[in-house]
């Protein structure tokens, strides 16, 4: 099934969204810290 329809599952999508959310939070935090330090 490496080239089948089951390669794009909702559980996989949710994990990707969670990672994106986490990265956005971390990068946002870093950006705010940089601005603060200036």
């Amino acid at each position: 099934h490496s080239d089948g329809i089951f390669t794009d599952s909702y559980s996989r999508y949710r994990k990707q969204m969670a990672v994106k959310k986490y990265l956005a939070a971390v990068l946002g935090k870093r950006y705010k810290q940089r601005v603060k330090n200036k």
Epitope: H1, D3, G4, I5, T7, D8, S9, Y10, Y13
Partner: antibody, heavy 113, light 109 residues
Framework: QSVEESGGRLVTPGTPLTLTCTVS????????MNWVRQAPGKGLEWIGS??????TYYASWANGRFTISKTSSTTMDLKMTSPTTEDTATYFC?????????WGPGTLVTVSS | DPVMTQTPSSTSAAVGGTVTISCQSS???????LSWYQQKPGQPPNFLIY???NLASGVPSRFKGSGSGTQFTLTITDLECDDAATYYC??????????FGGGTEVVVK
Amino acid sequence: QSVEESGGRLVTPGTPLTLTCTVSGFSLSSAVMNWVRQAPGKGLEWIGSIVASGTTYYASWANGRFTISKTSSTTMDLKMTSPTTEDTATYFCARGGGEFFIWGPGTLVTVSS
Amino acid sequence: DPVMTQTPSSTSAAVGGTVTISCQSSESVYSNYLSWYQQKPGQPPNFLIYQASNLASGVPSRFKGSGSGTQFTLTITDLECDDAATYYCAGGYSENIVGFGGGTEVVVK
């Protein structure tokens, strides 16, 4: 992340028609996309899927009657080769493999002489 | 293609009541790829449950999916007026095809 269908209109039987699905917030290079239709007052009917590589899968009744293809990283098409009045329906595109977690609002196709 | 038989085609219950919808497949679904959808008139379907028993994001815990293999059930408890809709099951199969059930109209009295 969202999807939207376009291209639905009134056509006469036998006139080919192409519907387009435009996605935003993700790329078709990493998604499985589907076409699902619903005749007025009827249930949902899966037409087929296109996976990230471009490989397509169809319901047996749809094979030869419909062609799904990717036209860019954000658009895919459904070609109705020779529509009949039985193809009158709202056509939805939806993301997901075997389960459909992002749906468009649908586009109405009316086939009538 | 596999056939997904959904029963009943219509059911009704009072606010606060319980509704049970069944889906039977003519062959086993692939790796529990059975999902449930809610559809209201003029709207696209709304994704409720995936892989037979998992709630999609934002779906109330009043919705419960169960089953495996060829037999699946959607149970809605503590019915609300807003639950009035048509519900569909869909199964994914190892042949890389998908089949929908015929739908169940839920009327809330």
